[in-house]
Structure formats: structure tokens, C-alpha cells
């Protein structure tokens, strides 16, 4: 039950995270014009990964796409790539994790196969989250670097445009969405990896071997005494004695001559 919950929660958290990464990638407000201490502005500039926009005081907004590919700064291209890789990995991870969900039955899929798929999707989510966090952080670093550049023709690196000294850019809403979304995807991935451990069969099942001792016939199932998770009865870790199913505690309570060699 706990494994199913962990897996389900990991899936939901990752789903929200990936939706956030997609939203952040599409958003126009990666960088917004620094308003200093003036909240009311006549012309407000903001820029995304794909286009730059201008909002006038009336609310009229005009956006222009970056129609060049070669003319864009390498850093912007790198951020785009990281975000797209994050989305692609996350989408594949979601697809894999749907089939890996314990609550969904697909044919006669073994638990080991589901465990592998859960681990795969978990790793994909982790990498996806890291890509998003890295992309947003690179962009944020670019903004911080450019913020203090106050030369007359300040090159901001957003779409290769020349800025006048009065237009400075600061963190836009998309950066915060990206950081949170990347973090959620990362957490979801970790949860999937944790769930994978619970899904995996605890030990390879060998055929039971019989050991015959005088006076007693004991069927011993190898595997040792692993720590119980505390959920359900731990039947795998019990020794079965002929003439009554006694637990390991009971055996220790009644020592026989065969316990001392």
C-alpha cells in the first residue's frame, strides 16, 4: 500500500512539475524590465525564450518572435535546449511511469518489470528536473551579469537587441515557475526511485531445500531475517516447522539439542 502511494504521489508531483516546466518554457516573462521604485510605467518590456514583448500603459501588448536562429546568443540557445530536453525526458518519463503504476494492470506484467520501469521513469524525472533547474539558473545568471552593465549600448543577450542604458532587466515570473517546477519534477523522480525499491522482489526465489535432522524434519527457506517494513505479515522471513507453524521467536524460546553443535 505504501509503495503504491509513494509511486502514485511521485507520478502526480512529477506530472505537476513537468506541466510547470512546459508552462515556464512557453512563458514570455523570463526577464522583465526593472521598474526601480516606480510601479507605474508607460512602456513595460519583458522577454521570453521565444519572443520579446512590450506592454504600453493602456494595456496594449505587442510581441515579436526571435525569427533568427544563428543570430541568437549561445546562452539563450543553451537555455532553450536544456528546457526542451527537460520537457522531452519528462514526457517520456510520464509515459513510462503510467505503465509502471502498481494500480494499473497491463496483461501479466511482472513486478520486476514494473520496478524497472518505475526506476527508469524516476531517473528520467530527476534528469528532467535538473535540466529545468539548470536552464533557469543559467538564464538567471545571465540576467544578473547583464543587470550591472550600464554602458550606452548595453547588450543584454536577449534576442541580440541593443538596449539603451535606462532599460535594465530583472527576474521574470517564468524563472520562479521554472525553479519550482524543476524542483517538483526532481522530488517526483526521487519518490519514484524510492517506490521502485518497494516494488522489486526482495530476493531471488530459490526452491526450498530440505535439511533432515534426527527427530525433526525441517524445511528451511533461505533468505535470512531481513528488516520488516512494518506493513503486512512478513511470511517470507518465517521458518516453517513440521508439526506446527511456529515463528522464529517461538523456536528461540524452546531450544533443542540440535541448536547447539
Amino acid at each position: 500500500m505504501a509503495v503504491t502511494a509513494c509511486q502514485g504521489l511521485g507520478f502526480v508531483v512529477s506530472l505537476i512539475g513537468i506541466a510547470g516546466i512546459i508552462a515556464a518554457t512557453c512563458m514570455d516573462q523570463w526577464s522583465t524590465q526593472d521598474l526601480y521604485n516606480n510601479p507605474v510605467t508607460a512602456v513595460f518590456n519583458y522577454q521570453g525564450l521565444w519572443r520579446s514583448c512590450v506592454r504600453e500603459s493602456s494595456g496594449f501588448t505587442e510581441c515579436r518572435g526571435y525569427f533568427t536562429l544563428l543570430g541568437l546568443p549561445a546562452m539563450l540557445q543553451a537555455v532553450r535546449a536544456l528546457m526542451i530536453v527537460g520537457i522531452v525526458l519528462g514526457a517520456i518519463g510520464l509515459l513510462v511511469s503510467i505503465f509502471a503504476l502498481k494500480c494499473i494492470r497491463i496483461g501479466s506484467m511482472e513486478d520486476s518489470a514494473k520496478a524497472n520501469m518505475t526506476l527508469t521513469s524516476g531517473i528520467m524525472f530527476i534528469v528532467s528536473g535538473l535540466c529545468a533547474i539548470a536552464g533557469v539558473s543559467v538564464f538567471a545568471n545571465m540576467l544578473v551579469t547583464n543587470f550591472w552593465m550600464s554602458t550606452a549600448n548595453m547588450y543584454t543577450g536577449m534576442g541580440g537587441m541593443v538596449q539603451t542604458v535606462q532599460t535594465r532587466y530583472t527576474f521574470g515570473a517564468a524563472l520562479f515557475v521554472g525553479w519550482v517546477a524543476g524542483g517538483l519534477t526532481l522530488i517526483g523522480g526521487v519518490m519514484m526511485c524510492i517506490a521502485c525499491r518497494g516494488l522489486a522482489p526482495e530476493e531471488t526465489n530459490y526452491k526450498a531445500v530440505s535439511y533432515h535432522a534426527s527427530g525433526h524434519s525441517v524445511a528451511y527457506k533461505p533468505g535470512g531475517f531481513k528488516a520488516s517494513t512494518g506493513f503486512g505479515s512478513n511470511t517470507k522471513n518465517k521458518k516453517i516447522y513440521d508439526g506446527g507453524a511456529r515463528t522464529e521467536d517461538e523456536v528461540q524460546s524452546y531450544p533443542s539439542k540440535h541448536d547447539y553443535v
Epitope: T41, V43, E56, S57, S58, T164, Q166
Partner: antibody
Framework: EVQLQQSGTVLARPGTSVKMSCKAS????????MHWVKQRPGQGLEWIGA????????TYTQKFKGKARLTAVTSASTAYMELSSLTNEDSAVYYC????????????WGQGTSVTVSS | DIVMTQSPSSLTVTAGEKVTMSCKSS????????????LTWYQQKPGQPPKLLIY???TRESGVPDRFTGSGSGTDFTLTISSVQAEDLAVYSC?????????FGAGTKLELK
């Protein structure tokens, strides 16, 4: 048709206050900025400030902070400007003008309210 | 604040003549985000409120005759009337529409000979 109807001529004593109105019609009052502009006889235009009735945003030029107070009553589609501590320098024609949707321009103007400050 | 300087302060012309007037701003009015110049031109006839002629430095307001042309970029702007008519006699003012507080030029008065 967009119309801005301003209140009539005002004669005031120095040190007093006046409140003029600008009644808007023919458009959604809450969706545009309302600008106020001063023009002294034989002189150029001087921007006082503007307010956005839909968001209660107001901005003034430094010179008129404390002198002019811009308000609006959305239910009546009317903008107001109150001028306090009047001096002879405040004698002018005051225009209200609607902020255009494009270019931060002022596309429709009221006929103006003439204020004369005299003792 | 951005200071707007207009020249000449007055112009005496004959009907049918081509007229140009200048407007200079103390700071660039070019917005890099959309490559538009936030400069507006108004016409004010005696005893009347101003009338919007041109916004974004070169875009004519609807209903404005095409003899009025706005040009320029950055800090230097020009209003040209290709063939002056009697009804064009007025004061022409330019306005910074780029940043608050909005500021106007002193105006150029167009008079007939």
C-alpha cells in the same frame, strides 16, 4: 462617439481649492487612462498626471504632487482633479484627455476648464 | 525628466508650401523591445483643445490627412507638412510618450504670410 465633458469656468481666491470634473461617455471608462494637462495663456502644454480608474493607478509629475489630486468615480464615469492652495500660477486652462490604446498618446480631449485665481 | 525642445518657435509660410519642424528629446525615445519611438505630435488651433496627429513618431491617427508625415528616431524627430493648407495654421507640439512624467515641447506656431 467618445466625448469628454468638462465642468465650467472657475473663479477662485488664492489659498483656496477647486475641484473640476470630466464626464466621459462613448467608451468603457475603466479601460483607459485619464490624463490631465495644464495650459497657461499663450504657453505650451504641461502634463499634470494621469489615473487609471479600472485599477486605481495614479501617476503625477513631481511638480504637481501635493498640488493636484486625481480621482475617479467609476459608477458615474467621471474623473476629477482637485487643485489645492491656489496661487496666481494656477490660473490656466485644464484639459482632461483620454489615453489612447496605442502609443501612450491622448486621442480625445475635453473642451477645457478655465481656472482664474484672483483676490 | 525628459526635456523636449522644439524648433523653430514659429514659422511663417505660404499656402502650398512644404514645411518641416523639429523636435529633440534629452533622452532616446526608442524602445528596443519593439523598435518603436514613443513620440507623439499634436495640433492645437486657437481656442480649441489639442488634437492627436501622429503617434509612435510616424503613425498617423485615423482621419489625419496624409500631407502630415512624422519621421525620426532616438532623439531627433521631424513633422513635415507636404503642402500647407489654411486650416493647418495652428501650434504643433511634440510629446514624450516613453516614460513618466510625460513632457511636451513648447510648440511650433505655424502662421500664414
Amino acid at each position: 462617439e467618445v466625448q469628454l465633458q468638462q465642468s465650467g469656468t472657475v473663479l477662485a481666491r488664492p489659498g483656496t481649492s477647486v475641484k473640476m470634473s470630466c464626464k466621459a461617455s462613448g467608451y468603457r471608462f475603466t479601460s483607459s487612462w485619464m490624463h490631465w494637462v495644464k495650459q497657461r495663456p499663450g504657453q505650451g502644454l504641461e502634463w499634470i498626471g494621469a489615473n487609471y480608474p479600472g485599477k486605481s493607478d495614479t501617476t503625477y509629475t513631481q511638480k504637481f504632487k501635493g498640488k493636484a489630486r486625481l480621482t475617479a468615480v467609476t459608477s458615474a464615469s467621471t474623473a476629477y482633479m482637485e487643485l489645492s492652495s491656489l496661487t496666481n500660477e494656477d490660473s490656466a486652462v485644464y484639459y482632461c484627455a483620454r489615453g489612447a490604446y496605442y502609443g501612450n498618446a491622448m486621442d480625445y480631449w475635453g473642451q477645457g476648464t478655465s481656472v482664474t485665481v484672483s483676490s | 525628466d525628459i526635456v523636449m525642445t522644439q524648433s523653430p518657435s514659429s514659422l511663417t509660410v505660404t499656402a502650398g508650401e512644404k514645411v518641416t519642424m523639429s523636435c529633440k528629446s534629452s533622452q532616446s525615445l526608442l524602445n528596443s523591445g519593439n523598435q518603436k519611438n514613443y513620440l507623439t505630435w499634436y495640433q492645437q488651433k486657437p481656442g480649441q483643445p489639442p488634437k492627436l496627429l501622429i503617434y509612435w513618431a510616424s503613425t498617423r491617427e485615423s482621419g489625419v490627412p496624409d500631407r502630415f508625415t512624422g519621421s525620426g528616431s532616438g532623439t531627433d524627430f521631424t513633422l513635415t507638412i507636404s503642402s500647407v493648407q489654411a486650416e493647418d495654421l495652428a501650434v504643433y507640439s511634440c510629446q514624450n510618450a516613453y516614460s513618466y512624467p510625460f513632457t511636451f515641447g513648447a510648440g511650433t506656431k505655424l502662421e500664414l504670410k
